[in-house]
Amino acid sequence: SCNTATCVTHRLAGLLSRSGGVVKDNFVPTNVGSKAF
C-alpha cells in the first residue's frame, strides 16, 4: 500500500478507498436553490 506522507495523511483523514486510492470528490450540488439561474 501507499506509504507516502500524502497517502498517510489521506488515510488518517479517512479519504482512502478500500483499494488504497484516494476517493474522488463527487460533485453533489448543495443548496442548488440558493443560486439563481
Epitope: N26, F27, V28, P29, N31, V32, G33, S34, K35, A36, F37
Partner: antibody, heavy 115, light 108 residues
Framework: EVQLQQSGPELVKPGASVKMSCKAS????????MHWVKQKPGQGLEWIGY????????KYNEKFKGKATLTSDKSSSTAYMELSSLTSEDSAVYYC????????WGQGTTLTVSS | EIVLTQSPTTMAASPGEKITITCSAS???????LHWYQQKPGFSPKVLIY???NLASGVPARFSGSGSGTSYSLTIGTMEAEDVATYYC?????????FGSGTKLEIK
Amino acid sequence: EVQLQQSGPELVKPGASVKMSCKASGYTFTSSVMHWVKQKPGQGLEWIGYINPYNDGTKYNEKFKGKATLTSDKSSSTAYMELSSLTSEDSAVYYCAKGGNDGYWGQGTTLTVSS
Amino acid sequence: EIVLTQSPTTMAASPGEKITITCSASSSISSIYLHWYQQKPGFSPKVLIYRASNLASGVPARFSGSGSGTSYSLTIGTMEAEDVATYYCQQGSTIPFTFGSGTKLEIK
C-alpha cells in the same frame, strides 16, 4: 465566454415526442446544474427541473414528471430535454439555464404542437 | 408548493421615478433562496438580484433588493427607458422552485 446554444424551433403533432438540446461552452459543464424553464406565449415562467451533469442526478417539478425527461452528455457538454405525449398545452418556449449566480440562459426553443 | 404573489401586476412609470415591486411568499423562506429576474420583450430572462439583495454581474446599481421571511421587494432607484420589462421573483427554498406571476413595467 459562457454560452448556452439551444436547438431550433420544433413543429410537432399531438401525441408525438420531441427532444431538444442545450449545448454549453465556456465553462466546465459538470460544475453546475442545468435548469429547464417553460414559458407559454404571453405568460410567466415555470420551472421544470434540473440535471446535475456530473452524475446525471435529476430533480423535477412533480407537474412535469412523466412529461419531461432530462439527460446530459458530458462528452459534448450538452443537456437534453425530451417531452412526450405532446398536447397543445405543451406549446411554449423552453429555456435551459445554468445554475450559479452568473445568469446564463439559452435563447430558448420554441415548441409548437399542432395537427 | 410555495406561491409567490407579485404586486403590482402592471405599472407605468416616468423616467427618473423610483419603482418598488413586491413579492409575497405563501410560506417563510430564507433570503438566500429568493432571486429576481428581468425579461425584456423577445429575450431570455436574466438574473438581476440573487439571494434577495446581491446585485448580479453587470446589473446597474440603480437596482436593489431587500426583504426577509415572506416579504421581499425589488427597487429601481431611478426608472430609465431601458428598464421596460417584466420582472419575476423566484424561490429556491423548496422543490418545486417557483416564480412569481410577474410585474410588467411600462414607461409613461
